[in-house]
Interface confidence: medium
């Protein structure tokens, strides 16, 4: 006899894992065989979906992998054409294992500003989301939270905050680890000991001290009256993200020295500066209060000039006499360039003579000063022009130091080789006589204030000049 | 970073030449004076020759005098000992060397790792 | 030409103190010699210590000073630290003649 169809096993909620087989079975008792549909959602599970297995005439509906997007109400209907259709529904949960679908990545962050590690993650039941600081659980507080995202959220970020993280995705299923990923904390440069300012004597090593720090860990570059350093050596060391500049200078002028700490933030770069002056104290005479040692000149301006391993006189209020005498003669030298031919011996001669004297050993080493009658020599009859133009520019202060005052002695100053002619220098170089003088052309308009003794030849001397001579 | 790099060293016949150079950076080449000091295997140092900030003149060993030349370029920021009529003796490892200041004998106070120089038939 | 002298060898106990010298064959040692020292540790290249008899240079540990002791030159390690195994060697500026600079056969100090 017909009979309607009656759904003997009513569907029931089915869990199933993402990947596994979930089965439905929807057993109906009829007479004739009934046509068993299936649908999800409301919508037709078609017969050819390779995704399904459809058996037993339609009673048994079988997902074959199951994927999280299945799940949702599975109903069957059961018709034969007697009675009406009848209809029994399920649910389909899906279990899912937790999975991070947008794990954290590698930050770099400047210090004081906002990190945000992402940490998405998927799985049924919701998996709870925490974080792991290098081996230990990351603690909340009221800088650090993770959202209910999962990201992990650090406000102000501090430069303990950088390290290793790894973001945990935990649910009854099992738990699921992100890769480690580094937040990286950069931290603009700051100067932490800025180099100080100096009074000092021409000639002096002055150390100037820069330390800085910040990461990147900075670079730092000094700069000297707005260019950079053309000097100097500059001695580096980097400790525990500090890094410690010295620049060692060899002062022969005032100067403005900047310390710049610089480091790069992605494109950008920060920067700090920090500056010193140094001034040059005024000279003390080089006949007051000399301390110094004699030894033998080693340099090699003043070769050609004084005697062969001549005993000079280093004056120790320099940091290192022979470098920064050597230097003074250096620099006067250059300016003797653009003098006469007839000027330039004699003034070389005088110069060499004056800022390396010769020394008297004795128990307190003495410098010998050159005689004033051959100073005169140099400035009346050889240099009457160049010393009239020197002098004339060191009043208008068109000299950027005091090194060329030094440089050239004050020769009312110099004692008279008539008074003791063992207590001051001559000048071997100086070779001529008062023979010589009658046929030299008068440089200046006054006499000579001193009568020009008759100088000594030097044997030794490498050239001798004399005033009528014409040198190229 | 100051540095002096040593090149050209290498092995040459008794009477044969050879010359070396000596690469500086990191510090202002022409303020300061520089040497070459040598090293016999086993032995002490040895100054060889030496030159000062603006190379107006050249000092050498009484031993290496007419056989050696140093010079130096100060565009290139670089020294040169050319070395001729090589003898088994110049056998060493040659140091170029910075000196403390200008003048051509303050003391050396930067040196390179050295270049080996080997006479031998 | 004048032959500058040194020790061979010296030995020093850790944080003792040692003086290595340094004279010239014939005649003394002065302030025209500009002596300094120079330490050089096994396939090292020479690293200078000391300038013009007494000067430190930058980087020097202060336990090591110049000075002249006699008619020579001395190089003083006041507490001497295992580091400091080296070989010593000084270098005098020979002013006459040639103008050359000599340098002396060297010291090899152990630290015991």
């Known amino acids: 006899l017909p009979k309607a169809p009656v759904i003997t096993t009513p569907l029931e909620t089915v869990d199933a894992l993402v990947e596994e087989v979930a089965t439905f079975m929807c057993a109906v008792e009829s007479y004739p065989q009934p046509e068993i549909s299936w649908t999800r959602n409301k919508i037709l599970i078609k017969l050819f979906d390779t995704r399904y297995s459809i058996r037993e005439n339609g009673q048994l509906l079988t997902i074959l992998s199951v994927e999280d997007s299945d799940d949702g109400i599975y109903c069957c209907t059961a018709n034969n054409g007697v009675g009406g259709a009848v209809e029994s529904c399920g649910a389909l949960q899906v279990k899912m294992k937790p999975k991070i679908t947008r794990p954290p990545i590698n930050v770099k962050i400047i210090e004081g500003l906002k990190a945000v590690l992402p940490c998405t993650t998927m799985g049924n039941p919701k998996p709870s989301v925490s974080w792991i600081k290098g081996d230990s659980p990351l603690r909340e507080n009221s800088r650090i939270a993770v959202l209910e995202s999962g990201s992990l959220r650090i406000h102000n970020v501090q430069k303990e905050d950088a390290g290793q993280y790894r973001c945990v995705a935990k649910n009854s299923l099992g738990t699921a680890y992100s890769k480690v990923v580094k937040l990286e904390v950069e931290v603009f440069a700051r100067i932490l000991r800025a180099p100080e300012s100096h009074n000092v004597t021409f000639g002096s090593f002055v150390t100037l001290h820069c330390t800085a720090t910040g990461i990147p860990v900075p670079t730092i570059t000094w700069i000297e009256n707005g260019n950079a350093v053309s000097s100097g050596s500059i001695q580096e060391s980097v400790k525990d993200r500090v890094i410690d500049s010295r620049l060692q200078l060899f002062i022969t002028k005032p100067g403005l020295y900047t310390c710049i700490a610089t480091n790069k933030h992605g494109e950008k770069f920060s920067t700090a500066k920090a500056a010193a002056t140094i001034s040059i104290a005024e000279w003390s005479k080089p006949q007051k209060d000399n301390k110094g040692y004699c030894a033998q000149y080693r340099g090699e301006v003043c070769n050609a000039v004084l005697a062969k391993d001549a005993l000079v006189f280093l004056n120790t209020s320099y940091a290192d006499p022979e470098e920064a005498q050597e230097l003074l003669v250096h620099t006067a030298w250059n300016e003797l360039k653009v003098v006469s031919p007839v000027c330039r011996p004699a003034a070389e001669a005088l110069l060499c003579n004056h800022i390396f004297q010769e020394c008297s050993p004795g128990v307190v080493p003495t410098p010998i000063p050159i005689c004033r009658e051959y100073c005169l020599a140099v400035k009346e009859l050889f240099c009457a022009k160049e010393w009239l133009v020197m002098e004339e520019k060191t009043h208008r202060g068109l000299y950027r130091s005091e090194m060329h005052l030094l440089s050239v002695p004050e020769c009312s100053k110099l004692p008279s080789m008539h008074w003791d002619p063992t207590a001051c220098a001559r000048l071997p170089h100086l070779d001529y006589n008062k023979e010589n003088l009658k046929t030299f052309p008068p440089m200046t308009s006054s006499k000579p204030s001193v009568d020009i003794p008759n100088l000594p030849s030097s044997s030794s001397s490498s050239f001798s000049v004399s005033p009528t001579y014409s040198m190229t | 970073e100051l540095q002096l790099v040593e090149s050209g060293g290498g092995l040459v016949q008794p009477g044969g030449s050879l010359r070396l150079s000596c690469a500086a950076s990191?510090?202002?080449?022409?303020?300061?004076?520089m040497s070459w000091v040598r090293q016999a295997p086993g032995k002490g140092l040895e100054w060889v020759s030496a030159?000062?900030?603006?190379?107006?003149?050249?000092y050498y060993k009484e031993s290496v005098k007419g056989r050696f030349t140093i010079s130096r370029d100060n565009a290139k920021k670089t020294l040169y000992l050319q070395m001729n009529s090589l003898k088994s003796e110049d056998t060493a490892v040659y140091y170029c060397a910075k000196r403390s200041g200008r003048i051509a004998f303050g003391a050396l106070d930067a040196w390179g790792q050295g270049t080996l120089v080997t006479v031998s038939s | 030409q004048a032959v500058v002298t040194q020790e061979p060898s010296l030995s020093v106990s850790p944080g003792g103190t040692v003086t290595l010298t340094c004279g010239l064959s014939?005649?003394?040692?002065?302030?025209?010699?500009?002596p300094d020292w120079y330490q050089q540790t096994p396939g090292q290249a020479p690293r200078a210590l000391i300038y013009?008899?007494?000067s430190r240079l930058s980087g020097v540990p202060s336990r090591f000073s110049g000075s002249f002791s006699g008619n020579k030159a001395a190089l003083t390690i006041t507490g001497a630290q295992p580091e400091d195994e080296a070989d010593y060697y000084c270098a005098l500026y020979m002013g006459s003649g040639s103008r050359n600079y000599v340098f002396g056969g060297g010291t090899k100090l152990t630290v015991l």
């Open positions: 030159i000062p900030w603006n190379g107006g003149s050249t």
């Open positions: 990191g510090f202002t080449f022409d303020d300061y004076g």
């Open positions: 014939s005649g003394s040692v002065t302030s025209s010699n500009y």
């Open positions: 013009s008899t007494n």
